[in-house]
């Protein structure tokens, strides 16, 4: 028997100097395009080679983003939110939650999937 | 992982078209960037066009604009470009490219770095 596959949601603030290139990273997600079943929310799809965010490296794909500069990104056209963060200055601080698979059950069984992807 | 299939290429006198297909695996397509590249003997890959998640975006290279068009079906999970009045130095190996989700970042339409994900190219030859 397999044992169950949990999630451990954490919260953090990380503070991103906009590189020569930007922030270095992509989103998916808004209430137009709904990446995750029943939410809206903007998440990090692909964090780029050598940018502001790998750099950092806190950010990670998977990341759920709350908040950009402290404005909620709840209820957001995806073009909406790609905007927000191309206009959101030089330095910028984002509030995301983290979510990190763990296993509880029997030892040497892995659950499979990610309800995210 | 995400495969993508080019099909359509072949050869044809100049002034003619051409319809390319990239068919792409997985469930989240609608959420891709998509684009075209192509690559000429003895060249560097070039960029051709690119179209956003849901069509409302495109953008062209200048030597094409006016001749190819870029679309795609979320449906159907395609990527197509159409290509009319093609010239000879039109000819080229082309290649679909998909980055997932959309850059926060001013675009940088021409860098192949941009995209994750490629097709093994179709080739075009205008005579």
């Known amino acids: 028997m397999n044992g169950r596959v949990d999630y451990l949601v954490t919260e953090e603030e990380i503070n991103l100097t906009r590189g020569p290139s930007g922030l270095g990273f992509n989103i998916v997600g808004g209430t137009d395009q709904q990446y995750v079943s029943n939410d809206s929310g903007i998440y990090v799809s692909r964090i780029k080679e050598n940018g502001a965010a790998a750099l950092d490296g806190r950010l990670q794909e998977g990341d759920k983003i709350l908040s950009v500069n402290g404005q909620d990104l709840k209820n957001l056209l995806h073009q909406d939110a790609v905007d927000l963060f191309r206009n959101a200055g030089y330095a910028v601080s984002l509030r995301v939650q983290h979510r990190l698979q763990v296993q509880n059950g029997p030892i040497g069984h892995r659950g499979e999937g990610d309800p995210s992807g | 992982q995400v495969q993508l299939v080019e099909s359509g290429g072949g050869l044809v006198q100049t002034g003619g078209s051409l319809r390319l297909s990239c068919a792409a695996s997985g469930r989240t397509f609608s959420t891709y960037t998509m684009a075209w590249f192509r690559q000429a003997p003895g060249k560097e890959r070039e960029f051709v066009a690119d179209?956003?998640?849901?069509?409302?975006?495109?953008y062209y290279a200048d030597s094409v604009k006016g001749r190819f068009t870029i679309s795609r079906d979320n449906a159907k999970n395609t990527v197509y470009l159409q290509m009319n009045s093609l010239k000879p130095e039109d000819t080229a190996v082309y290649y679909c490219a998909a980055a997932i989700g959309s850059t926060v970042d001013s675009y940088y339409h021409s860098d192949p770095l941009e995209y994750d994900y490629w097709g093994q190219g179709t080739q075009v030859t205008v005579s």
């Open positions: 179209i956003n998640w849901n069509g409302g975006s495109t």
